[in-house]
Interface confidence: low
């Protein structure tokens, strides 16, 4: 697959567009909606039939430096009796997000956009059974 | 990427903060060469809290197409394939960063934007409120 390019040519370029060197783009990392908060149902990671834990990954050369990853607690799912049912599977649900990566090259710094795959939580699924001939 | 001179104290001093505005390469790097190892999953359909995916398109944003999950049921699917309303299907939401064209319509000038997306659904035990 091709590496995606962000710049699009189909836009009529307004006069007010800032000058940008070829092959690069200007990125303001002051985040729009910075103070928006997730209004997820309370403690769903513990109440789910496919519960998960969170781990915070930290990288000072990444913006944002903190990225939270979920890990499913069980291979199976939790049944009504609170026991693990291995006839069902807990599976991770993933979502891509963008981060800015800072790279040091000698006394210079460069910035690169990077896609990061985040595990957001888990869901309980019926397994796919492969029958051996 | 595009190189930017570091502060005069280089190489001893290290600037801990990111500048407010940076120049970045147009190519998006992805260290996981396979963009999404779960590409071929059909969890949306096999889940006990199944969901549909709805297309949200905005040419002023990168990525321009984002998919929103909507839980199909209020309850969860039980072993008999019926909806069990003693359990709840709830969306799993995630804040992600996207690029917003700023000023609008400019091809190579962006600002980071945080948006909330529903990625999928999970089945949870409901919180029961007892009325006194």
């Amino acid at each position: 697959r091709k590496i995606p390019k962000v710049g699009h040519t189909f836009f009529q370029k307004p006069e007010s567009c800032p000058p940008v060197p070829g092959g690069s783009m200007k990125l303001d990392i002051g985040i729009i909606n910075e103070n928006q908060r997730v209004s997820m149902s309370r403690n769903i990671e513990s109440r789910s039939t496919s519960p998960w834990n969170y781990t915070v990954t930290w990288d000072p050369n990444r913006y944002p430096s903190e990225v939270v990853q979920a890990q499913c607690r069980n291979l199976g799912c939790i049944n009504a009796q609170g026991k693990e049912d291995i006839s069902m599977n807990s599976v991770p649900i993933q979502q891509e997000t963008l981060v800015v990566r800072r790279k040091h090259q000698g006394c210079s710094v460069s910035f690169q956009l990077e896609k990061v795959l985040v595990t957001v939580g888990c869901t309980c699924v019926t397994p796919v059974i492969h029958h051996v001939q | 990427g595009i190189t930017i001179p570091r502060n005069p104290g280089c190489p001893n001093s290290e600037d801990k903060n990111f500048p407010r505005t940076v120049m970045v390469n147009l190519n998006i790097h992805n260290r996981n060469t396979n963009t999404n190892p779960k590409r071929s999953s059909d969890y949306y359909n096999r889940s006990t809290s199944p969901w549909n995916l709805h297309r949200n398109e905005d040419p002023e944003r990168y990525p321009s197409v984002i998919w929103e999950a909507k839980c199909r049921h209020l309850g969860c699917i039980n072993a008999d394939g019926n909806v069990d309303y003693h359990m709840n299907s709830v969306p799993i939401q995630q804040e992600i960063l996207v690029l917003r064209r700023e000023p609008p319509h400019c091809p190579n000038s962006f600002r980071l934007e945080k948006i909330l997306v529903s990625v999928g659904c999970t089945c949870v035990t409901p919180i029961v409120h007892h009325v006194a």
Epitope: - | K38, R39, D42, N45, N52, W67
Partner: nanobody
Framework: EVQLVESGGRLVQAGGSLRLSCAAS????????MGWFRQAPGKEREFVAA????????AYTDFVRGRFTISRDDARNTVYLHMTSLKPEDTAVYYC??????????????????WGQGTQVTVSS
């Protein structure tokens, strides 16, 4: 397993219309997003249109948008491609495909697990 059978392809004059059908049998039809692809002689197979399992999401490639319409009738287990204002460059074998995955992209051929045998559409000038 899902079996797909296309029909409706024929010779038609430029500017004319056609409706292709894709009948599905096998596992639950409604659980599959469906797509149409086409392959002209000597060219690679290319994405034409797709529809989500609920039918409320559709996607088209630029060169057919506004001329072609994809729809599905789950009661009949059939997907349709209604083609209008046909051009000679629309001449190709049209394939119906079903996918077991759904991650927000419609146009990657690799994501489609089940394919029909194809139906020939020829547009004469």
């Amino acid at each position: 397993e899902v079996q797909l059978v296309e029909s409706g392809g024929r010779l038609v004059q430029a500017g004319g219309s056609l409706r292709l059908s894709c009948a599905a049998s096998g596992r639950t039809f409604t659980s599959y997003p469906m797509g149409w692809f086409r392959q002209a002689p000597g060219k690679e197979r290319e994405f034409v249109a797709a529809i989500s399992m609920s039918g409320d999401d559709t996607a088209y490639t630029d060169f057919v948008r506004g001329r072609f319409t994809i729809s599905r009738d789950d009661a009949r287990n059939t997907v349709y491609l209604h083609m209008t204002s046909l051009k000679p460059e629309d001449t190709a074998v049209y394939y119906c495909a079903a996918r077991t995955s759904y991650d927000g992209t419609y146009d990657y051929i690799d994501d489609y697990s089940y394919w029909g045998q194809g139906t020939q559409v020829t547009v004469s000038s």
